[in-house]
């Protein structure tokens, strides 16, 4: 009986010869738990595991801690892969994080972090980032040092307010800080002067809600 081949991330999928963009099943080593993730096999050499995507407002991102933990949405469209999977994955080896952004005027930009990982659930999936390059701002729009993850039912931010309730979506809020890629999706011509939109301050400022975002990870040595 042939051994079942499993892949922990899209880099492994790519290296196995599957070089077509699409949804693949990923499994962590020593685990039977499977997740479906979209793999970008074309951008910047391929092998990217998409951990977040916003593109049309079809999925509600104002979700609970548990939903952000296990993931939600549609891997072919808008989705969140899941904090638990990403935490476990990024603690097994060194990963880079690339955040690709689109505005409503046809511009695109990115932020690339040379080292990214999430702490465990016990530490509220705190984000850790190092080494920023890219075109979406010289300063990180994810506050440094990294913050704990907050959702509408888990207030771990540094604000007297509850950022996740007020700005909507789960995120690594500060007080409340320069970004929220899981904010409310606003269509074109309704996307300015929004407190609670999809924000990346050091590219588009505070009131601008973006058209599209993709967060993707790949092993640093790929």
């Amino acid at each position: 009986k042939g051994e079942q081949i499993s892949f922990r991330d899209c880099a492994e999928v790519f290296k196995s010869g599957h070089t077509t963009n699409g949804v693949y099943t990923l499994t962590l080593p020593n685990s039977t738990e499977e997740v479906k993730a979209y793999c970008d096999m074309e951008a910047g050499g391929g092998g990217w595991t998409i951990i977040q995507r916003r593109e049309d407002g079809s999925v509600d991102f104002q979700r609970t801690w548990k939903e952000y933990k296990v993931g939600f949405g549609n891997p072919s469209g808008e989705y969140w892969l899941g904090n638990e999977f990403v935490s476990q994955l990024t603690n097994q080896q060194r990963y880079v994080l690339k955040i690709h952004l689109k505005d409503w005027e046809g511009n695109e930009a990115y932020s690339l972090y040379e080292h990214f990982y999430l702490s465990s659930e016990e530490l509220n999936y705190r984000i850790h980032l190092k080494g920023l390059t890219g075109t979406a701002g010289k300063i990180s729009s994810i506050s440094q040092p990294g913050n704990d993850f907050s959702t509408k039912d888990a207030d771990n931010d540094k604000c007297i307010c509850k950022c996740s309730q007020m700005l909507t979506g789960g995120w690594w809020f500060d007080a409340c800080g320069p970004s929220n890629l899981n904010g409310m999706y606003y269509p074109q011509r309704q996307n300015t002067n929004k407190f609670n939109g999809i924000k990346w301050y050091y590219w588009k400022g505070s009131g601008y809600s973006l058209k599209g975002t993709t967060m993707m990870i790949r092993p640093a040595g790929f």
Partner: antibody, heavy 121, light 107 residues
Framework: QVQLVQSGAEVKKPGASVKVSCKAS????????MVWVRQAPGQGLEWMGY????????GYNQKFEGRVTMTTDTSTSTAYMELRSLRSDDTAVYYC??????????????WGQGTLVTVSS | DIQMTQSPSSVSASVGDRVTITCKAS??????VAWYQQKPGKAPKLLIY???TRDTGVPSRFSGSGSGTDFTLTISSLQPEDFATYYC?????????FGGGTKVEIK
Amino acid sequence: QVQLVQSGAEVKKPGASVKVSCKASGYSFTDYNMVWVRQAPGQGLEWMGYIDPYNGGTGYNQKFEGRVTMTTDTSTSTAYMELRSLRSDDTAVYYCARTRDRYDVWYFDVWGQGTLVTVSS
Amino acid sequence: DIQMTQSPSSVSASVGDRVTITCKASQDVYIAVAWYQQKPGKAPKLLIYWASTRDTGVPSRFSGSGSGTDFTLTISSLQPEDFATYYCHQYSSYPPTFGGGTKVEIK
């Protein structure tokens, strides 16, 4: 100490424009958004818009869209608010105020002394 | 726009009195409410933000409470310097809006 000092009173004719300045001192000018709020005689407060001195980004109250322009000069730590096509109901005291946060337009913790703009023929 | 309805529009009180001013938002503003004090011919002064947090240097006799749509500013023991107009302000959504003001006058 943190201070916002505004330009002096102005008298303008209907249809004209006015440009009010607001010079900041005692803090890093580009670290906080600046808002403009007006108050008609004996009336309440009305938010006109904000400017982010860090990147020049603006957000205006729709009521004033197309008639108001907010700018900054970071070299002199000065914010400006220009209101065009003035009408008699634009007669008010115009205040600049600093927001407590760069990333969001929250509450306003430091205010200028106000500039009275009178529109009269 | 979110309407902030303040009441009463004016109140006459004596030194030492407890004064309560209320503000009702036309929709949920969470705790994104500030209170300002304004004296004649002067700029407003921030008293309270995030509904209940006193700004630096604001006396403890001023307190704020509320969440959602109903907010209250309380002056526990009115002092001579507290006679002024008070405004609530929501900053939960654009455009930020203010209540109509409450004038606290000497009885």
